[in-house]
């Protein structure tokens, strides 16, 4: 038997993807665990093969039909269970009902590019991935420059409260270099969280023109 | 502001039919979901059949294989055809529609129609 405390929390991307994580401190380790999903209303049934991401935690991600599909509701409410074999039968670690639109998280945007940069400035863009038509453009977004010299968690955040998928950056010191990210989240979910963080885009800004500040 | 307008209810004998139909109109929403409810005096309003994107359609156990649920996404209209009708189904018959606007899901109730079931 596995004692211990055990957490399993799980998102939905608001399209087809259910993402889960399983955490039980004092977890065998080479248990074979995995996460079925049973709709209340619908005729699939999904499972996904949990996946060592740490010592004591376990993630996978339920595929529930092409991206960009709406697999799931408001109304949908999604039976989950992690299930790890024991000998020749499965025994149930975890279980919850799960309403999928009041845990949601995007996934991470994407295509971020440099539209135009300056010795000052820099016009960064990019694109939502995934995101369910329910939204329309009521999504909010948080940005954040890295620069030379500091980490991550001192970037001051920037906040866009509207699906604006471009940024304007500026006081930006010249010929110097920069990396940017962004997350993305909708205002619908009791449980909501930010998407992960973009992939970091790399940019440097333009050299001032000798004699003159531009 | 958003509006629920049904209608076809009314009295029918046992073993009757009749066709409820539900219209929703006004501001700019999507819709993912339309339903039927059912209200007895004394009792809580309860569910009858609704019908969610995706065309996954759930009844009442009191009603299946009697009830049917049709939505027209487009119309953004929901009917419910109901057949051998008893006299336990009498009750007011409201509408429920699960709209998204400006980003927040939220339902709206239409006022409810009347269905006597009589013996």
């Known amino acids: 038997a596995v004692n211990g405390t055990s957490q399993f929390t799980c998102f939905y991307n608001s399209r087809a993807n259910i993402s889960c994580v399983w955490s039980q401190d004092g977890a065998l380790q080479d248990t074979s665990c995995q996460v079925h999903a049973w709709p209340d209303r619908r005729r699939w049934n999904q499972t996904c093969e949990l996946l060592p991401v740490s010592q004591a935690s376990w993630a996978c991600n339920l595929i529930l039909g092409a991206p960009d599909s709406q697999k799931l509701t408001t109304v949908d409410i999604v039976t989950l269970r992690v299930l790890c074999r024991e000998g020749v039968r499965w025994r149930v670690m975890a279980i919850q009902d799960f309403k999928p639109f009041e845990n949601l998280r995007l996934m991470a945007p994407i295509s971020l590019q440099v539209v135009h940069v300056e010795t000052h400035r820099c016009n960064i863009s990019w694109e939502i991935s995934q995101a369910s038509h329910y939204f329309e453009r009521h999504l909010e977004f948080e940005a954040r420059t890295l620069s030379p010299g500091h980490t991550w968690e001192e970037a001051p955040l920037l906040t866009l409260k509207q699906k604006q998928e471009w940024i304007c950056l500026e006081t930006l010191t010249p010929d110097t270099q920069y990396e940017f990210q962004v997350r993305v989240k909708p205002l619908q979910g009791e449980f909501t969280t930010w998407s992960p963080w973009s992939q970091p885009l790399a940019f440097r800004t333009k050299p001032a023109a000798l004699g003159k500040d531009t | 502001q958003v509006q629920l307008q049904e209608s076809g209810g009314g009295l029918v004998q046992t073993g009757g039919s009749l066709r409820l139909s539900c219209a929703v109109s006004?501001?700019?929403?999507?819709?993912?979901?339309m339903g039927w409810y059912r209200q007895v005096p004394g009792k809580q309003r309860e569910l009858v059949a609704d019908m969610a994107d995706g065309g996954s359609a759930k009844y009442a156990d009191s009603v299946k294989g009697r009830f049917s649920i049709l939505r027209d996404s487009v119309k953004n209209t929901v009917y419910l055809q109901m057949s051998s009708l008893k006299p336990e189904d009498t009750g007011i018959y409201y509408c429920k529609a699960g709209l998204w606007l400006a980003g927040r899901h939220s339902d709206y109730w239409g006022q409810g129609t009347q269905v006597t079931v009589s013996s």
């Open positions: 006004g501001s700019r929403f999507i819709s993912d979901v």
